[in-house]
């Protein structure tokens, strides 16, 4: 029987609360054999593809998407999807990126280390199981 592709996971380093102007790296993970990872914003029309995939473990692939200098426009939800031939996976859960002012007032939250959104069971979404459109020309390591 055909195996369903496992949903990817997404995490952010150093966390999901990032000071303005600092860097953040989104890490997408999927099974062995992934050839493309895609990092999507809330709107599917804004995304970044990378074929710079590494083998995180004998059973896991990963790709990293770095934003060098975070701005307020980078705040919001992100999720991952991947292409393992011949299919695209479902999307990961959303991970919310929060951007805080560097003044660091008493109420501003600290950076959360190792924040991630792993796969959870939810209804199947097959809208990406065909070849998705080509990358929109954004650099793999630099989202915006």
């Amino acid at each position: 029987q055909e195996e369903d592709l496992p949903r990817p996971s997404i995490s952010a380093e150093p966390g999901t609360v990032i000071p303005l102007g600092s860097h953040v790296t989104f890490v997408c993970r999927g099974p062995v054999g992934v050839q493309t990872f895609r990092l999507e914003r809330e709107s599917r029309s804004t995304y970044n593809d990378t074929e710079d995939v590494s083998q995180a473990s004998p059973s896991e692939s990963e790709a990293r998407f770095r934003i060098d200098s975070v701005s307020e426009g980078n705040a919001g939800p992100y999720r991952c999807i991947y292409y393992k031939p011949p299919k695209w996976s479902e999307q990961s859960d959303y991970l919310e990126l929060l951007v805080k002012e560097t003044s660091g007032g008493p109420d501003s939250p600290d950076t959360e280390p190792g924040s991630s959104a792993g796969p959870t069971q939810r209804p199947s979404d097959n809208s990406h199981n065909e070849h998705a459109p080509a990358s929109q020309g954004l650099k793999a390591e630099h989202l915006y």
Epitope: E51, Q55, P85, P86, H131
Partner: antibody
């Protein structure tokens, strides 16, 4: 041990058709792999022809030059064929079958020893 | 259409030397590249996948690396058994196909 063996290579005349068969030993096709054909003309480099998905669907991938004249099919859980039509002298080559698996990020391994196809009048 | 251009062709080196073979891609296929070794009368043998990961049983004298669209295979401490032709290949299942480079022959002086 996992291995592949090709058969069906022959000497045929230009314009003829030929079907090559690849048989797997030690494994059966699965959703984690593709089965592929590659050819090598005498003294020349490797030329990828086509691959077919080992899972339930029959997704196929072809080199642009091979579309229309070559057909790749799974005929069982351990055999794949390559049908070739309108053969010309330029198709003279050793034809290899290879497995392309997710564990190797789709590098081709193993390969069969090859079967020789000669097109001559 | 993706084109993989291998250089140099051929290369001659002595036992114990280090040999470097390059594979220039016309498009960025990321890490989806493999290297093979082929000896006369034999099928190719997978050496490296994912541009730098050694295939099972391949000695660490073989090293793959990548910088942008340029991929490099380095063979150190060259042995007589390394005399062969080496091919790079895009392993990306997409519209550009699984193209091979033209091959680089390594001969032992």
């Amino acid at each position: 041990e996992q291995s592949l063996e090709e058969s069906g290579g022959d000497l045929v005349k230009p314009g003829a058709s030929l079907t090559l068969t690849c048989k797997a030993s030690g494994f059966s096709f699965s959703s984690s792999e593709f089965m592929c054909w590659v050819r090598q003309a005498p003294g020349k480099g490797l030329e990828w022809i086509a691959c077919i998905y080992g899972g339930l669907s029959d997704d196929t991938y072809f080199a642009s030059w091979a579309k229309g004249r070559f057909t790749i099919s799974k005929t069982s859980s351990i055999t794949v064929t390559l049908q070739m039509t309108s053969l010309t002298a330029a198709d003279t080559a050793t034809y290899f079958c290879a497995r392309s698996c997710d564990v190797n990020y789709y590098g081709f391994d193993p390969w069969g020893p090859g079967t020789l196809v000669t097109i001559s009048s | 259409e993706l084109v993989l251009t291998q250089t140099p062709a051929p290369v001659s080196a002595a036992v114990g030397d280090t040999v470097t073979i390059k594979c220039q891609a016309s498009q960025n296929k990321g890490t989806n590249l493999a290297w093979y070794q082929q000896k006369p009368g034999q099928p190719p043998k997978l050496l490296i996948y994912l541009s730098s990961t050694l295939a099972s049983g391949v000695p660490p004298r073989f090293k793959g690396s990548r910088s942008g669209t340029e991929y490099t295979l380095t063979i150190s401490d060259l042995e007589c058994a390394d005399a062969a032709t080496y091919f790079c290949q895009s392993t990306y299942y997409g519209s550009n196909g699984l193209t091979f480079g033209g091959g680089t022959e390594v001969e032992i002086k």
